[in-house]
Interface confidence: medium
């Protein structure tokens, strides 16, 4: 094995090409230069190296970067991107956006890989906040990431970046996520007119307090039975029937399908039945007439 | 979702040619290399080669040199298999497939049947 | 080429039952990577780099082995787990695969 540590005479590599898938793993690690793999890394993807050839190649970079390698590299990875580890993604410092945009190509049409997600941490902490161009490049390739970061995450998120958020994207975000992103998109979304606002707000609107959704019911913006479903039941509980009306416009007819569900089985419970009988759908379970309705929680408020 | 879409079947007559086509969706068709695999009914499976979409290189398994010639169209993400000079050696389900470390994606196949 | 040996070429096991199948290279390689065919169907990557199991892969598969010799088990065999497994290498060129190991339910 030590004789074999020195390049055999006129196989020294002068630059990457095709001619290297026919080295052995030993004779590319003694002929290939690593800071002349650096520098011609665009062109590794295009050439069928096996397996243990690019793990020999991922060596050379590791020994040349030690501390991590540069972006000027890191760009140019391809699928060798593949082959890197959570922890030798730590020590990158990716600031490009074009950078970043190269490696999810790399990914795209899979789930998040730990790669990526390790990636991912490390651009938008080195960029302090979720821009609109990340979270727009983010959510181009993952629709769902805006909902896997926590709470604590989104307070980063400025309302600018609002914008960039697609009706899909928050399909899986949780009533806490939404209570985060609903004030900076009604920030973002203020100057608008009523119908183009609703249009904008309405997948944000799971995070909406009983208020706004008073004032929404005051612009004829017809919510759909989805959106409704969405609605916080504490926000939606002190509606009146009337509200819940304007509220819905003509897809009112759909509480009828789903009374038994929350939120609206609790709003339910808490209208006059006499009101609901106004709807003309049927809705059953309201207080009935003659009870007097007490709000303890009013009460306590008070005392 | 990444999908590789190929025809289902192929008929064609001893010593003909035959192109069979893969075409490839969500992902970036350019970045990686597109494998052709043959496997002939109730056997193994046997690498034919591999194209690089964005340059064009390939790599065939020496056996399948002769055989098959591998293409593709970047405008329309497809990947194009040529067999020449067909005989009933060749009668085969062939797949195109994405092969790479920790994922795999495979065209459902097409089934190649050499008959007169 | 390296050629790729598997054994056994048919066996049987029960549900419950612990299944072992091998791989044995003509000459070492770094990884092995082994598939599952199910009759009709397209290869599914199980196990890539010899022991990381591939997306959605049930963790009672597991891979294992070095240079030449490498191998697959399931731990608790399932009826779904009927198939043919197929181990294959990336170490040299071509790209080879074995012939098969043809795993029925008993």
């Known amino acids: 094995e030590v004789e074999k540590t020195a390049c055999p005479s006129g196989k020294k590599a002068r630059e990457i090409d095709e001619s290297l898938i026919f080295y052995k793993k030993w004779e590319l690690e003694a002929c290939v230069d690593a800071a002349l793999l650096a520098t011609q890394m665009d062109r590794v993807n295009a050439i069928p190296f096996t397996y243990e050839q690019l793990d020999v190649l991922k060596h050379k970079l590791d020994e040349l970067y030690p501390q991590g390698y540069p972006e000027s590299v890191i760009q140019h990875l391809g699928y060798l991107f593949l082959k890197m580890s959570p922890e030798d993604i730590r020590k990158w410092n990716v600031t490009s956006l074009e950078t970043l945009k190269a490696l999810l190509e790399v990914n795209k049409g899979h789930e998040m890989s730990p790669q990526v997600a390790t990636l991912i941490d490390r651009f938008v902490k080195g960029r302090g906040q979720l821009d609109k161009d990340t979270l727009d490049t983010l959510t181009a390739f993952y629709p769902g990431y805006l909902c896997s970061l926590s709470p604590e995450e989104l307070s980063s998120v400025p309302p600018s970046s609002i914008w960039a958020v697609r009706p899909q994207d928050l399909d899986t975000c949780d009533p806490r996520q939404l209570d985060v992103l609903y004030p900076k998109a009604r920030l973002a979304f203020q100057n608008m007119n009523g119908s183009e606002y609703f249009v904008k707000i309405q997948s944000f609107l799971g995070g909406a307090p009983t208020e706004d959704l008073k004032a929404l019911s005051q612009q004829n913006v017809s919510m759909d039975l989805a959106t409704f479903m969405k609605l916080r039941t504490d926000a939606v509980l002190p509606l009146t029937v009337a509200e819940v009306q304007k509220l819905l416009g003509p897809h009112v007819e759909g509480l009828k399908a789903e009374e038994r569900h929350r939120p609206v089985r609790d709003w339910i419970l808490r209208q006059r039945q006499d009101d609901l009988d106004t709807l003309g759908l049927g809705l059953q379970g309201g207080i009935p007439n003659g009870y007097l309705v007490l709000d303890l929680s009013m009460q306590e408020a008070l005392s | 979702q990444v999908q590789l879409q190929q025809p289902g079947a192929e008929l064609v007559k001893p010593g003909a040619s035959v192109k069979l086509s893969c075409k490839a969706s969500?992902?970036?068709?350019?970045?990686?290399?597109m494998h052709w695999v043959k496997q002939r009914p109730g056997q193994g499976l046997e690498w034919i080669g591999m194209i690089h979409p964005n340059s064009g290189n390939t790599n065939y398994n020496e056996k399948f040199k002769s055989k098959a010639t591998l293409t593709v169209d970047k405008s329309s993400s497809t990947a194009y298999m040529q067999l020449s000079s067909l005989t009933s050696e060749d009668s085969a389900v062939y797949y195109c497939?994405?092969?790479?470390?920790?994922?795999?994606?495979w065209g459902t196949g097409t089934t190649v049947t050499v008959s007169s | 080429q390296i050629v790729l040996t598997q054994s056994p070429a048919i066996m049987s096991a029960s549900p419950g039952e612990k299944v072992t199948m091998t791989c044995s290279a003509s000459?070492?390689?770094?990884?092995m990577y082994w598939y599952q065919q199910k009759p009709g169907s397209s290869p599914r990557l199980l196990i890539y780099d010899t022991s990381n199991l591939a997306s959605g892969v049930p963790v009672r598969f597991s891979g294992s082995g070095s240079g030449t010799s490498y191998s697959l088990t399931i731990s608790r065999m399932e009826a779904e787990d009927a198939a043919t497994y197929y181990c294959?290498?990336?170490?040299?060129?071509?790209?080879?695969f074995g012939a098969g190991t043809k795993l029925e339910l008993k």
């Open positions: 497939s994405l092969i790479h470390w920790y994922f795999d994606v």
């Open positions: 294959q290498q990336w170490s040299s060129y071509p790209l080879t």
């Open positions: 000459s070492s390689v770094s990884y």
């Open positions: 969500g992902y970036t068709f350019t970045i990686y290399w």
